[in-house]
């Protein structure tokens, strides 16, 4: 299933992650999928 609104898939972590985390961890792979 696709990730819910406000989250993005992380291949590194193998789960959906909150886009809000990108403020703290901007280089995380899933941040590329966050608007």
């Amino acid at each position: 299933a696709p990730c819910s609104r406000g989250s993005s898939w992380s291949a590194d972590l193998d789960k959906c992650m909150d886009c809000a985390s990108c403020r703290a961890r901007p280089h995380s792979d899933f941040c590329l999928g966050c608007a």
Partner: antibody, heavy 119, light 111 residues
Framework: EVKLEESGGGLVQPGGSMKLSCVAS????????MSWVRQSPEKGLEWLAE??????????HYAESVKGKFTISRDDSKSRLYLQMNNLRAENTGIYYC??????????WGQGTTLTVSS | DIVLTQSPASLTVSLGQRATISCRAS??????????MQWYQQRPGQPPKLLIK???NLDSGVPARFSGSGSGTDFTLNIHPVEEEDAATYYC?????????FGGGTKLEIK
């Protein structure tokens, strides 16, 4: 199963030093920010110190109340977190929790270790 | 430092009813997109457990009867329907800036 296990607590006299340790398992330790949080009846939950990742040059941050007195460190090869505490006072008494978070929240908590500062 | 004020300090809720806990921050902890507020549950003799991150996002494995809302300075944790196992103390925590701070806690009792 995620596990964080603290050790090193106990009774110490005012002015003394203590080093707490925490061993982690069940998650990718080297990809998590790690912190120490203290709980006491007087002050509730208090964040004390944080250490980030190797890619952040192991950046550390401290609460003003422990700056210059406590030192947080980590050993990723052993999945261990440490807190060196110097010049301890009665107000440093409490339960010390080792915590881990992917970012700016606390995903994982240990059971805590109790430190008592008293003569 | 940002001060988080929780209310009420304690509340008693009947089984199956709604529990509402508030957390007010001394300054905004939100951007236009996200709010940097977490909620934790602490049962007696246990460490805190993450329930909700970024104001509204349920942590994995947390029952859907828990929900979070709010932005800016005012945040709310709702539990509905309340179950016996929800008897605990609940804390809010901001991550807007360092130092991270926690609210003083709200003790929930179930009748």
């Amino acid at each position: 199963e995620v596990k964080l296990e603290e050790s090193g607590g106990g009774l110490v006299q005012p002015g003394g030093s203590m080093k707490l340790s925490c061993v982690a398992s069940g998650f990718t330790f080297n990809n998590y920010w790690m912190s120490w949080v203290r709980q006491s009846p007087e002050k509730g939950l208090e964040w004390l110190a944080e250490i980030r990742l190797k890619s952040d040059n192991y950046a550390t941050h401290y609460a003003e109340s422990v700056k210059g007195k406590f030192t947080i460190s980590r050993d990723d090869s052993k999945s261990r977190l440490y807190l060196q505490m110097n010049n301890l006072r009665a107000e440093n008494t409490g339960i010390y929790y080792c915590t881990g978070g992917f970012a700016d929240y606390f995903d994982y908590w240990g059971q805590g270790t109790t430190l008592t500062v008293s003569s | 430092d940002i001060v988080l004020t929780q209310s009420p300090a304690s509340l008693t809720v009947s089984l199956g009813q709604r529990a509402t806990i508030s957390c007010r921050a001394s300054q905004s902890v939100s951007t236009s997109s996200y709010s940097y507020m977490q909620w934790y549950q602490q049962r007696p003799g246990q460490p805190p457990k993450l329930l909700i991150k970024y104001a509204t996002n349920l942590d994995s494995g947390v029952p859907a009867r828990f929900s979070g809302s709010g932005s800016g300075t005012d945040f709310t944790l709702n539990i509905h329907p309340v179950e016996e196992e929800d008897a605990a103390t609940y804390y809010c925590q901001h991550s807007w800036e360092i130092p991270y701070t926690f609210g003083g806690g709200t003790k929930l009792e179930i009748k």
